[in-house]
Amino acid sequence: IRAEKAMVDGSWLDLAKRSKLEAQPFAHLTINATDIPSGSHKVSLSSWYHDRGWAKISNMTFSNGKLIVNQDGFYYLYANICFRHHETSGDLATEYLQLMVYVTKTSIKIPSSHTLMKGGSTKYWSGNSEFHFYSINVGGFFKLRSGEEISIEVSNPSLLDPDQDATYFGAFKVRDID
Amino acid sequence: IRAEKAMVDGSWLDLAKRSKLEAQPFAHLTINATDIPSGSHKVSLSSWYHDRGWAKISNMTFSNGKLIVNQDGFYYLYANICFRHHETSGDLATEYLQLMVYVTKTSIKIPSSHTLMKGGSTKYWSGNSEFHFYSINVGGFFKLRSGEEISIEVSNPSLLDPDQDATYFGAFKVRDID
Amino acid sequence: IRAEKAMVDGSWLDLAKRSKLEAQPFAHLTINATDIPSGSHKVSLSSWYHDRGWAKISNMTFSNGKLIVNQDGFYYLYANICFRHHETSGDLATEYLQLMVYVTKTSIKIPSSHTLMKGGSTKYWSGNSEFHFYSINVGGFFKLRSGEEISIEVSNPSLLDPDQDATYFGAFKVRDID
């Protein structure tokens, strides 16, 4: 029976470890600055890195600019978006800006898109200063189903800070759905 | 066999509980206001509480102003930094401020420092108002190896809000590395 | 013994699954805009949804405007608070605003309230712009005991954005207390 108990312990340890790893999808995606859209209106950001620098993904999929859920669960979602402008980049079309981020969920089964989180600020970036900067952070806990897609929309994408420490979003699974 | 099953269950419950607790390092460090550097340039903040008020640490180490990772894993890192100024504190040298935070990772094996997250804003804190306040929040999910160190850099440290609910940073382990 | 092992495995799987789900309380509460207080002073927000749209709760209780902890543990707490003003809403009493959030913990055993996290900004919302917006995000890792209550206080509640993606707070349990 001792040998049997050891076998049970061993198989259980394997199962626990394996199931724990399988049960915890995550992603941390950083902005791909080579393909940032221009304009000041709200646009969906489709170019993100998933496998270089701080960017990584496991048990989730990145496709067509969207983070796709492969496993039902409750996830913590977050986004950090930085905007900046230096006078050497040229004059702003307007000094009154609306700098916003929207974290949206799209369901393929029911083709609809819903905003999970939003954040931002209106700013007056006057010519009295040569440099302007502003960051937004949002985060929240959401139920996600396999096949659902997370995407990021921002206003004024041409003002985005292209650094990997500045503009990113991510998710990690916290628990199963009952 | 029933007794044996109970023994298996009991030992497993202990093992599961024990391994779960051991597998989840965390820290929440709050600013130690007795030792905030002066100056307006970017500086590393080295004085943090780890065992009073809301501050706490487990299975991580705080040493020389840095949060040291003792256990490989994927961690959620976060920081909340508040800046404030009241006219009774004196005159600002400039009303145009860059209020920033940088969460950095240092690896001892390869002596290099990299910024994981940044946030902040440029601000115009005019003399027309007697009080000014601004907070930054950043958060993200990162792979950390044992021995790596997390530290916080800010600009204008003399403007930091010294309250434990205002200026803090932390980490908690979410999952093992595959 | 094989049958016994299968039984052990089966019972363990049930136990592991059950204990895992039971061990992970969470809540994501969204603002109930039908009952937002007026005024510019700091007030406690007591009307939140817990079971519609993105709002949800499990193994925690929402009562009398407070999120009640039912299970000891270390929790990640977060809040996202959005303020907005459009000129069509009328003139602001003052253009100099202090837009703040305070996440507080109340213990019934020791009737006292303490601020866990705060964030916000002073803003100058001038009449030169027809629309103003600002969001705050805070988050942190805290030890919570059964019976303790989490509540949200804000300044200028009449400026709150009533959307579920804008103004919300939440918590999820990360680990047990040793």
């Epitope: 009295n128 200063s129 040569e130 440099f131 | 002066s38 100056g39 307006s40 340039h41 504190s89 004196g90 005159d91 600002l92 040298a93 400039t94 009303e95 145009y96 401020l97 860059q98 440029t122 005019s126 003399g127 204008n156 440290p157 003399s158 403007l159 | -």
Partner: nanobody
Amino acid sequence: EVQLVESGGGLVQPGGSLRLSCAASGRTFSRSAMGWFRQAPGKGREFVGFITGSGGTTYYADSVKGRFTISRDNAQNPVYLQMNSLRPEDTAVYYCAVYRRTYISSTYSESSEYDYWGQGTLVTVSS
């Protein structure tokens, strides 16, 4: 890295005027408070004047008060030192520097309170 470049120096007769400028380049947020200093041949570095980031407040050494004026463009760069009624004792290399503190301290006239020094520009007052 921040770089400061002073210009506008030269030879001028006593009673004459010169306008020095200090331009910042590199990774800078040039709305910082700035100071002007000078170093005469064989002497230590001497405080000349100080201007806040907004330009709203200026301080001067007693030796130049009423003759020198520090200003800055509304749109940040550069910072100017207008020198009138120049005297032979004003002969020196003039430097600009970035004030390192967030608050104006009583020690604003000490060179240790500044960093990112420029290379300097020589002003010679002689007939």
